[in-house]
Each structure stands twice: as structure tokens, then as C-alpha cells.
């Protein structure tokens, strides 16, 4: 239940509360207030202060994590007294319950799946659930299909990315009539786990002199265009020796993704595949399947 | 290769709209995300707007809000550029180009561009 | 005024290597976005010379590299031609105008 953030405090206390599905610290509003100030410090003495106005009664924290446990603070002068609270943020639970090894990663343009794995001191019990708000925070999204190991949940399944931001923060919560269980939560680029497919329609074509391989580039999540991709080729002339080197590639892409190399007649057998990556990135997809080239006889 | 020829220089009186248009040949024009660039002896190169692939829209520089119009005909692979409520300052040469890069917002590929005068 | 300050003029002998500074402030390159340079023949429409801070489309003569450092970027030309004579422009994109700007531009003059 929401309290008017605009009474007035008794002057002993500010009475601090946070909301951390929202991330919103909230105080009692002072009248006659000169200054405010919240700010945050986690365990690693880090501290966060978001902008606030002088005439406002709460503050939104963006992009942090609380799974470490944080303190709030919150300081406020008024024309009469200056006032300070604290407000711990514990992770309350047992110790070592909280879901581990957490990871996502997004795949074949629109589907994600996050695997994490049971805490090692969590008990038989124990049931996690994912949570992901999107950098607006305007929705909250439940994961729709839950990957289980003997019964508890140790992944998800999304195949609806519509919901993601840029940045987004993944809480995973848990459960057990046994005892507290902790929460997991961490901030997320769809940029940096997106894995994306191999480039597509690759082909090869070849006159006397040269040949001319030309490819797609992939379908992805991130809305990018050509110049945000780097391809590298594997260029491979087949029945050679073991251990002798390929010949990698590396190519911008450009808007008629294309590689012209000399290559004349006759031909030796040849393999091209190609994979694609993040130019910023260069987290490289898989090879796409070797298409083949030349002649046995060459 | 792909090529983007502009219509031919304009002459305007104060008040007057000017239409611009920018043909897209050798790659189709829905595949590419085509943004406006002026450039004046005083203001050097100002953006104008273009269609931004994450939004899914164009969208415009705030300080030609209102002014400036940017469509496309995707079945003549023609996109135009309409700025109205001409003035002097308004003089400039303008291009259209392709954002080859929606990560670092780099133009790649460029018209000749398009005089246009305005002048009472 | 420009956003991204870049000196008016720089020049070198031929086979000289020059430099072209680009600087900006914490809510364009600094934030920090990603700087792309163009080159400017005279009488022509720009080209692409470098984008994402240091990358090259094809076609773009490895002689052009660039980097940057904090708030401000750096276009270097190795093993000056006579060709390379136009003006150059940085570009980044500015959170507080929430649009992409560009630097007033540099003549380069090969001696």
C-alpha cells in the first residue's frame, strides 16, 4: 500500500523505504527543504547517486544490483535542522541459496534462454523464478517456460524478446518452505549476449583467374546494419596436409558483402565457410557450412 | 554498385517549401535506412533526420521540428526530403546518404547532393 | 559554433604523416560514443573514411587510422599524397542535443 510521499515527517525520522520493484527510495517530504541527497553504497564501497531535485521526496536508482546487499541513504536539510537516515537492503536468506553461474544468451535473432544452477547450500526444495524488467522498467517480464532439473527450475526459455531494452536487469528469486532462499539479480547488454547465426546464401563463383564468394549477413535481434559486422573467411584447400595452415580472412562488411580472390585453372578442390561477429564485439557465430569449390583433379 | 543521384538544384523565395528527392539504385531501398545531411559555408554539416532502425521511424533533428518532412516511396526506391518556411540561412547544399553503421551512426555511401538557394 | 572543435588547417610535404585532432566533452565522445571521420574532396559529397572510433570500410587505404582517448579522437594520414588534399570532418553522436554532430572540419594542404 502506497503512502502520500508529500506528508510531513515526524522530525525524528525520514522514514526511508525503498521498493525494489521500481527502484524507487522514498522519504517523508520535509517542509521548508533547502537541500536533499540519496545515494547508495554496496559492499565494495562503490557509491551511486542519482539527480535529484531539491524539491523532491524520492529517488530512482537505473542500473544496479543488489543481490551483494546495499545501504540507502538518504540526507535532507531544511531551513530549521538537517536530518540522515540509513537503510539496509540486505539479501536476507541463507547463505549460499541464491541461484549461481547465471548466464543468458540470445539466439536465432529473437529467442533467449538463461541457465543458472542451484545454490550449493540451497535445500531439496527450492524453486527459482526469473523476473526481467527492461531498462524503462514500464513492464515486468515472467519467464513463460522454465527449463527444470529434477523438478527445480534451472533455466528459461523466451521466444517473445519484445519486452528487451538495450539493457536489462534479470532477477532471479527463490523459494523453499524450509528456509529464506536468496535473491540473484544482474544488469544485462543485449549487445554483449547476443550469439548470432552464421551469415547465409553463401556462395562461390569462379572464372579463370579469380573467384568471388558472396553471403548475407545474419538476421539478429539488434537492429544493425552493414558496417556492424565483421566477417572472417576460411578459405581451405582440401586433402592437404595435417596442420597446414588456413587461410583466415578477415572482411567489413559492406552492403554487397562480397571477397574476390585470385584463383586460377585448374583448380585444386577449395572449402570457403564464413562466420559473422559484432564489429565492436568480435564475438564470433559459428562457421556456416563449407561450401566446396574446384576439382579432385585440379 | 549502389548509387544515390538527387534531383537537380532549387531556387527558392523566403516562405517556400522546397521538395528534395534522393533515387536509390543497385540495392532496394527498404533494406537501407536513409538519413539527410546539410552543409553550409557558416554551419558546416548539419543531420537533418533519418530513419533511425531502432525506433523504427524517422526521426528528426529537434531544431528542424516542424520544418522538415522525410518520406519514401519504396516502390521507386525514392526517398524525399521536404523542408518548408524557407529562409536565407536555409542556403546550403543537402545530401542524402546511407547510415551504414546504426551502432557508431556513420554515413556511408553519399549523393552528390542538391543546391538549394533561398533568396527574395 | 561546432560541438566537436577541430583545428582549421593542417598541412605536410608529401610522405609526411599528419594528424587531426577532434575534441568533444562528456556528452558526446566522451559519454562514450563511437566517432566516425570523413573526407571531403572539393566539389564532391563526403566519404567514409573511419567509423567506430578506429574501423575502416573497404576500399579505405589502411595510410588513414584514427583513435581515441577520453573526450577527444585523433584522424592520422600516413605517407601523404598529393590526393589526400581536402577537408576532413569528425563526427559523434551528443546526448544533451540527442542527435549526431559534426566537427567544423580540417583543410588538409600537402606542400
Known amino acids: 500500500e502506497k503512502s502520500d510521499l508529500r506528508t510531513v515527517a515526524p522530525a525524528s525520522s525520514l522514514n526511508v523505504r525503498f521498493d525494489s520493484r521500481t527502484m524507487n527510495l522514498s522519504w517523508d517530504c520535509q517542509e521548508n527543504t533547502t537541500f536533499s541527497k540519496c545515494f547508495l553504497t554496496d559492499k565494495k564501497n562503490r557509491v551511486v547517486e542519482p539527480r535529484l531535485s531539491n524539491n523532491e521526496c524520492s529517488c530512482t536508482f537505473r542500473e544496479i544490483c543488489l543481490h551483494e546487499g546495499v545501504t540507502f541513504e538518504v540526507h535532507v536539510n531544511t531551513s530549521q535542522r538537517g536530518f540522515q537516515q540509513k537503510l539496509l537492503y540486505p539479501n536476507s536468506g541463507r547463505e549460499g541459496t541464491a541461484a549461481q553461474n547465471f548466464s543468458c544468451f540470445i539466439y536465432n535473432a529473437d529467442l533467449m534462454n538463461c541457465t543458472w544452477a542451484r545454490g550449493p547450500t540451497a535445500p531439496r526444495d527450492v524453486q527459482y523464478f526469473l523476473y526481467i524488467r527492461n531498462s524503462k522498467r514500464r513492464r515486468e517480464i515472467r519467464c513463460p517456460y522454465y527449463i527444470q532439473d529434477s523438478g527445480t527450475h534451472v533455466g528459461c526459455h523466451l521466444d517473445n524478446l519484445s519486452g528487451l531494452t538495450s539493457r536489462n536487469y534479470f532477477l532471479v528469486n527463490g523459494t523453499s518452505r524450509e528456509i529464506g532462499i536468496q535473491f540473484f539479480d544482474s544488469l544485462l547488454d543485449t549487445k554483449k549476449i547476443e550469439r548470432f547465426n552464421p551469415p547465409s546464401n553463401v556462395t562461390v563463383r569462379c572464372n579463370t583467374t579469380h573467384c568471388l564468394v558472396r553471403w548475407k549477413q545474419p538476421r539478429t535481434y539488434q537492429k544493425l546494419s552493414y558496417l556492424d559486422f565483421q566477417y572472417q573467411l576460411d578459405v581451405h584447400r582440401k586433402n592437404t596436409q595435417p596442420g597446414t595452415e588456413n587461410l583466415l580472412i578477415n572482411v567489413s562488411g559492406d552492403l554487397e558483402n562480397r571477397y574476390n580472390f585470385p584463383s586460377s585453372e585448374p583448380r585444386a578442390k577449395h572449402s570457403v565457410k564464413i562466420r559473422a561477429a559484432d564489429v565492436r564485439i568480435l564475438n564470433w557465430s559459428s562457421w556456416s557450412e563449407a561450401i566446396e569449390f574446384g576439382s579432385d583433379d585440379g | 554498385q549502389v548509387q544515390l543521384v538527387q534531383s537537380g538544384a532549387e531556387v527558392k523565395k523566403p516562405g517556400a517549401s522546397v521538395k528534395v528527392s534522393c533515387k536509390i539504385s543497385?540495392?532496394?531501398?527498404?533494406?537501407?535506412?536513409i538519413h539527410w545531411v546539410r552543409q553550409t559555408p557558416t554551419k558546416g554539416f548539419e543531420w537533418m533526420g533519418g530513419f533511425d532502425p531502432e525506433e523504427n521511424e524517422i526521426v528528426y533533428a529537434q531544431r528542424f521540428q516542424g520544418r522538415v518532412t522525410m518520406t519514401e516511396d519504396t516502390s521507386i526506391d525514392t526517398a524525399y526530403l521536404t523542408l518548408s518556411s524557407l529562409r536565407s540561412d536555409d542556403t546550403a547544399v543537402y545530401y542524402c546518404?546511407?547510415?551504414?553503421?546504426?551502432?557508431?551512426?556513420?554515413?556511408?555511401?553519399w549523393g552528390k547532393g542538391t543546391m538549394v538557394t533561398v533568396s527574395s | 559554433q561546432a560541438v566537436l572543435t577541430q583545428p582549421s588547417s593542417v598541412s605536410g610535404a608529401p610522405g609526411q604523416r599528419v594528424t587531426i585532432s577532434c575534441t568533444g566533452s562528456?556528452?558526446?565522445?566522451?559519454?562514450?560514443?563511437?566517432v566516425s571521420w570523413y573526407q571531403q574532396l572539393p566539389g564532391t559529397a563526403p566519404k567514409l573514411l573511419i567509423y567506430h572510433n578506429n574501423k575502416r570500410p573497404s576500399g579505405v587505404p589502411d595510410r588513414f587510422s584514427a583513435s581515441k582517448s577520453g573526450t577527444s579522437a585523433s584522424l592520422a594520414i600516413t605517407g601523404l599524397q598529393a590526393d589526400d588534399e581536402a577537408d576532413y570532418y569528425c563526427q559523434s553522436y551528443d546526448s544533451e542535443d540527442r542527435m549526431t554532430e559534426f566537427g567544423g572540419g580540417t583543410k588538409v594542404t600537402v606542400l
Open positions: 546518404s546511407i547510415l551504414g553503421s546504426v551502432t557508431a551512426w556513420a554515413f556511408d555511401y
Open positions: 543497385g540495392h532496394s531501398l527498404s533494406e537501407l535506412s
Open positions: 562528456g556528452s558526446n565522445i566522451g559519454a562514450p560514443y563511437d
